[in-house]
Interface confidence: medium
């Protein structure tokens, strides 16, 4: 059975389908640009009692008195956007610690580096992936996922945290980027656009895809997320682009069909366990990899990003449901929740396959400018 959107067609669809980039090519940061804040208009983050920061929200750090093995992360500052003067009372819902917290949001002030200095770092995410410049690295072996096929019970928490929809994953989902590079999955969340406007975080040769899924993992070398933040390889994110296809994606429908229940910012529901691996592309052998950061405050660096070459297909109706159901605080829909691409600043994106050879319809002839940094591994 032929896999949809394989690299043989073109890398990640090669920009041949999906919407135009709302930022435009000229809006993509150059190598010299400092990291930019979010271009798309977005929503502020008004965390609820369990709303947690990071990519998108990492588990919070529980006090020592609670169970020992829990993966938790202390609340970090987020930036409060001004409320809607039309309805001050109803835009001012806060958790009871809200007065002590600031809030971040997509699009507009305050600048993220003021929220978390790491957001001004040199090695930030997301980035624009240029397959022609990727370094083919034969040492990058197929990803290994274990325990991702979850039974219906226990149910999982699906939450609208005001800046994404997030599914909290139970213990036992193991992922290996390679020998000795083992991780545990913590949560997954999505990034999307709006009607007629794509919303993936990463881009390919300037092409933005309709949406993107992130599965966030913690290295088994660390017991807690806060220990791993900022440490090279402490966190790893699997990312896949979502594209429009002719058929409904049954795996995604298990989540998308429940979004109306959590349309309100801060709300949550319980969903039956599902096959998490079915939310990802089927080809675990062809991917791009680089070291970057969380794409939301605290923007901690040292995150290993693995971006699948193959995309995942959702129906047009499903993509519309994703981008048009959830709400942020106030009278704002939760849309365009992606960060602008950040400069590579000398980083080399590695590919597990020869992405620069006969892979892009835009290339006149194949070139391979970068060599694999991990060739000796």
């Amino acid at each position: 059975q032929r896999l949809p959107r394989m690299q043989e067609d073109s890398p990640l669809g090669g920009g041949s389908s999906g919407e135009d980039d709302p930022l435009g090519e000229e809006d993509l940061p150059s190598e010299e640009d400092s990291p930019r804040e979010e271009d798309p208009p977005g929503e502020e983050d008004l965390p609820g009692e369990e709303d947690l920061p990071g990519e998108e929200d990492l588990p919070e750090v529980k006090p020592k008195s609670e169970e020992e093995g829990s993966l938790k992360l202390e609340d970090l500052p987020t930036v409060e956007a001004p409320g809607d003067p039309q309805e001050p009372q109803n835009n001012a819902h806060r958790d009871k610690e809200g007065d002590d917290q600031s809030h971040w949001r997509y699009g507009g002030d305050p600048p993220w580096p003021r929220v978390s200095p790491a957001c001004a770092g040199r090695f930030q995410s997301p980035v624009d992936i240029r397959p022609q410049l990727a370094a083919f690295c034969p040492a990058l072996r197929p990803l290994e996922l274990l325990g991702f096929q979850l039974p219906p019970l226990p149910e999982l928490r699906l939450r609208n945290n005001g800046h994404s929809v997030q599914l909290t994953l139970p213990p036992g989902l193991e992922m290996a980027l390679g020998p000795g590079r083992e991780y545990r999955a913590l949560q997954l969340h999505l990034h999307w656009g709006a009607a007629g406007r794509p919303g993936s975080e990463h881009t390919v040769e300037g092409h933005r895809f309709p949406a993107e899924i992130h599965v966030v993992h913690l290295s088994t070398a660390f017991a807690r997320v806060d220990e791993a933040l900022g440490r090279p390889g402490g966190l790893a994110v699997l990312a896949a682009f979502l594209e429009e296809g002719p058929e409904e994606n049954s795996a995604y429908e298990q989540l998308l069909s429940r979004l109306e229940e959590i349309a309100e910012e801060g709300s949550e529901t319980q969903v039956p366990g599902l096959d998490i691996s079915a939310l990802l592309p089927s080809d675990f052998s062809r991917y791009f990899q680089y070291e970057g950061s969380l794409t939301t405050p605290p923007c901690a660096q040292g995150v290993i990003w693995t971006v699948f070459n193959q995309t995942v297909m959702l129906s047009a109706k499903q993509l519309h449901t994703l981008s048009d159901t959830l709400w942020g605080p106030g009278d704002s829909r939760l849309q365009l929740n992606f960060r602008a691409t950040q400069p590579l600043n000398g980083r080399v994106i590695e590919a597990s396959f020869p992405a620069g050879v006969d892979s892009s319809p835009r290339a006149a002839e194949p070139v391979q400018l970068n060599s694999c940094l991990a060739a000796g591994d």
Epitope: Q86, E261, E264
Partner: antibody, heavy 121, light 111 residues
């Protein structure tokens, strides 16, 4: 300031009909779920029904098939059509807006001042 | 259908006292499906706590909510004269079917 104002209450005979209105000011109702809640004299609050921002409706078993919730977004008004009224429907009827847009969660703010419906022969 | 059992139905306490009201759901509900309301005589209810634990703007910080699953609690850390009122929990779930119900209410009187 967001305000909800109910109207249409009054005395009606058993088996009769009544339509309550809830007019909103200071906010666009179309983005919000809206609910009706009633309170019989000297009793507690009873949930009647809800209409989502997508205009789906749900009702308490006690009123299902007799009451209908609708809205007119152009008039920024919510309605409760009550048919086949019974003595036990006598209550103050409140409309309330979901505290946050979009969803169906059980947080309603603000509330109208209420309108009294008396079903008696 | 879902039932919300609230207790006590009546309590009398002095100014400055810590007051606790509990609400038990007949089945597990999500934290974001539970809220608390305050109603004073002749007035409409007022949202006091939403998503089980969160305070709307303007609600005094002496009010707090806790709980999950089937058991939820409203606490007034230091009772004030103006807190004399009836308190209701509202709980349920929004899924393919939408079910919600109020608790029976707790009347709080100042001694």
């Amino acid at each position: 300031e967001v305000q909800l104002l109910e109207s249409g209450g009054g005395l009606v005979q058993p088996g009769g009909s009544l339509r309550l209105s809830c007019a909103a000011s200071g906010i666009d109702l179309s983005n919000y779920a809206m609910t009706w809640v009633r309170q019989a004299p000297g009793k507690g609050l009873e949930w009647v029904g809800i209409i989502s921002s997508n205009d789906k409706t749900w009702y308490a078993d006690s009123v299902k098939g007799r009451f209908t919730i609708s809205r007119d977004n152009s008039k920024n008004t919510l309605y409760l059509q009550m048919n086949s009224l019974r003595a036990e429907d006598t209550a103050v009827y409140y409309c309330a807006k979901a505290a946050m847009p979009g969803g169906l969660k059980n947080a309603f703010d603000p509330w109208g001042q209420g309108t009294l419906v008396t079903v008696s022969s | 259908d879902i039932q919300m059992t609230q207790s006590p139905s009546f309590l009398s306490a002095s100014v400055g006292d810590r007051v606790t009201i509990t609400c038990q759901a007949s089945q597990t509900i999500g934290g974001s499906d539970l809220s608390w309301y305050q109603q004073k005589p002749g007035k409409a209810p007022k949202l006091l706590i939403y998503y089980a634990t969160n305070l709307p703007s303007g609600v005094p910080s002496r009010f707090s909510g806790s709980g999950s699953g089937t058991d939820f609690t409203l606490t007034i850390s230091s009772l004030q004269c103006e807190d004399a009122a009836t308190y209701y929990c509202l709980g349920g779930y929004a899924a393919a079917s939408y079910r919600t119900a109020f608790g029976g209410g707790t009347k709080v009187e100042i001694k």
